[in-house]
Interface confidence: medium
């Protein structure tokens, strides 16, 4: 299925609020009323689709230098070109230990290609420890463990997702570097398909073992908002999703995999310029709590609940949601205190369903694991009410949206 015209339409703004944050030397109002940004001179920094549009103040000289935003799961700091720290965040891969650097030849010679890479450490993404990621030529890393066809839709780390074609030039390479504490992917001298005359782009994404994510931009030869999204989505930011299984109406004994994007951060593309950088620092999540007491007493922005049978703390909105539902955790947690669980054997329960979505033996039409293997060709058509990848752009941790059904 080749990309359809208009397949990458820009998502519209969310239902915004200005989150806590400061611009150096300037205070920001802690919160705006939903859907309302009052000051006309505010410029949009990013969208946090777990909470809406985030606004930022501009400095008197109109040059944004450092901007901080709170996105529930991450705090982002944007460093402008004049900010020394933006240079410090750039990892000089050329100076790294040669044995830790790999030029990925498949990715470096190909258009619209992806390749799986194993990290040397567990990287916490939205609180989930990941060991395997998928690097794509189009300026992003797919963070999902289940491969599906609409790769650009969700579960990504995207310093600059766009229609890059490393195969255009021998100078274009996709390089990665792993020293055990940081994993860096660098898209080096890559050209936009059809826009080669604009020049080459060089940028990188760094995944730190503590969960920090850094986007660093060395060469951005054109205004990012001008990049066409007609052949490929254009996005900068983070996204995660969970997968759930629903009974298929057509085949009662089978279940249909659907993916829900529960959180997304979109940076304002106009802020992506040469020598700028963005740093995402992870905020605590329910998943980090290992005991009922710690879970129930946490003062996170999330509504954490303890599931005794799974021995897990969760808001119910993470990649383990299927298990959370299968084991009746939402019901179990209602109105109960930690003392109520102490006499119970947490090994005795079994899920409401005998199907485990985490088996290596998912029955699919090929050896790759795809979302929604029961769907037809028609199910892959883009949702006209959604963003470019067919995903709704208004899902939030508190809002259940329409799932995206992605066929094999």
């Amino acid at each position: 299925l080749s990309p359809q015209p208009g397949a990458g339409h820009d998502e519209g703004p969310g239902s915004g609020w200005a989150a806590k944050g400061t611009v150096r030397g300037w205070n920001r109002r802690a919160r705006e009323s939903p859907g309302h940004v009052s000051e006309p001179d505010r410029t949009q920094l990013s969208q946090d689709l777990g909470g809406g549009t985030l606004a930022m103040d501009t400095l008197p000289d109109n040059r944004t230098r450092v901007v901080e935003d709170n996105h529930s799961y991450y705090v982002s700091r944007l460093y402008g070109p004049s900010e020394p720290h933006s240079r410090e965040l750039w990892v000089d891969v050329a100076e790294a230990n040669r044995s830790q650097v790999k030029i990925h030849t498949i990715l470096s010679n190909t258009h619209r290609q992806a390749s799986r890479v194993v990290l040397s450490f567990d990287f916490p993404f939205y609180g989930h420890p990941l060991r395997q990621i998928t690097i794509a030529t189009g300026g992003f890393i797919f963070m999902g463990d289940v491969i599906h066809r609409m790769l650009t839709a969700t579960q990504y780390v995207a310093p600059l997702m766009a229609n890059f074609n490393p195969g255009y030039s021998d100078n274009s390479t996709v390089v990665y570097f792993d020293n055990g504490t940081v994993f860096v992917v660098q898209w080096d001298h890559v050209y936009l398909q059809g826009w080669e005359d604009k020049g080459s782009f060089t940028f990188q994404a760094a995944l730190h073992h503590d969960g920090r994510i850094v986007f660093a931009y060395k060469e951005i030869p054109m205004s990012v908002p001008e990049i066409s999204s007609s052949q490929h989505p254009v996005k900068t930011g983070l996204s995660d999703a969970f997968m759930i299984l629903n009974p298929s109406p057509d085949v009662p004994e089978s279940r249909r995999r659907s993916i829900f994007e529960y959180h997304r951060i979109e940076l304002d593309p106009s802020k992506v310029t040469s020598m700028s950088a963005v740093e995402f620092t992870p905020l605590p999540t329910c998943l980090q709590h290992r005991s009922c007491d710690a879970c129930m007493s946490s003062d996170l922005t999330f509504n954490c609940s303890w599931c005794h049978v799974l021995q897990r703390c969760s808001s119910g909105f993470d990649r383990y949601r299927q298990e959370w539902m299968d084991y009746g955790c939402a019901q179990e947690a209602e109105g109960r205190m930690c003392e109520d669980f102490q006499d119970e054997d947490h090994d005795s329960a079994s899920p409401d369903t005998s199907f485990s979505p985490y088996d290596g033996d998912l029955t699919t039409t090929s050896s790759s694991l795809f979302i929604d293997s029961l769907t037809t060709e028609d199910d892959t058509k883009l949702n006209p009410y959604a963003g470019g990848d067919g995903l709704q752009n208004n899902l939030s941790p508190k809002t259940k949206g329409t799932p995206v059904h992605l066929g094999t």
Epitope: Q113, A114, R116, V117, Q132, R149
Partner: antibody
């Protein structure tokens, strides 16, 4: 039924040409990268060439580069291998194989998850 | 090119016994490794992909492990239909390369 069926093999003299075909059925052909893999008599498997789902990307083993051309016709659900300047060492059973990929925007070249039954190419004078 | 080396070349095992096949890559291939089974006169058949994930329809007695440069295919209890040649293959880098094969024969 999901299957691949090769044809076009036979006896050819060194320096000659041959065109292999592989007819696919039972799956959406254009969504998958396809490949040719060969096996010389009594020997192991050797990857020959690969083509992406749209046909936009092709790759070759060094041993056949410049002599073999892989192509596909998605409207006919058919994969081809044009073999020119054949040598004795090209003698083998040629398998067409589907690459487990994901498509739409991207290809992820993974394992060969579906194979044809093979067609024998003999290069001899 | 990444060279894949399998050992042993031949493995003699009795039915019901456990078989362990090894595959070593000359440089890291991450988890981008597959195992195939081939019987005489037949095309290869995919058993394992991504180093450890069983392909559709493959019995649970087949399991794969490893990452980086060292990989193992284990057949927990050999059945008569498992006697065949087994190949590993990396798909981490061009050119795609196979090991030379391990023949599992009846002891």
């Amino acid at each position: 039924e999901v299957q691949l069926l090769e044809s076009g093999g036979g006896l050819v003299q060194p320096g000659g040409s041959l065109r292999l075909s592989c007819a696919a059925s039972g799956f959406t052909f254009s969504r998958y990268a396809m490949s040719w893999v060969r096996q010389a008599p009594g020997k192991g498997l050797e990857w020959v060439s690969i083509i992406s789902g749209t046909g936009g990307n092709t790759y070759y083993a060094d041993s056949v580069k410049g002599r073999f051309t892989i192509s596909r016709d998605n409207s006919k659900n058919t994969l081809y291998l044009q073999m020119n300047s054949l040598r004795a060492e090209d003698t083998a059973v040629y398998y067409c194989a589907r690459i487990d990929t994901f498509a739409y925007y991207y290809s992820l070249y993974r394992a060969f998850d579906l194979w044809g039954q093979g067609t024998l190419v003999t290069v001899s004078s | 090119e990444i060279v894949m080396t399998q050992s042993p070349a031949t493995l003699s095992v009795s039915p019901g016994e456990r078989a362990t096949l090894s595959c070593r890559a000359s440089q890291s291939v991450g988890g981008n490794l597959a195992w195939y089974q081939q019987k005489p006169g037949q095309a290869p058949r995919l058993l394992i992909y991504d180093a450890s994930t069983r392909a559709t329809g493959i019995p649970a007695r087949f399991s794969g492990s490893g990452s980086g440069t060292e990989f193992t295919l284990t057949i927990s209890s050999l059945q008569s239909e498992d006697f065949a040649v087994y190949y590993c293959q990396q798909y981490n880098d061009w050119p795609l390369t196979f090991g030379q094969g391990t023949k599992v024969e009846i002891k």
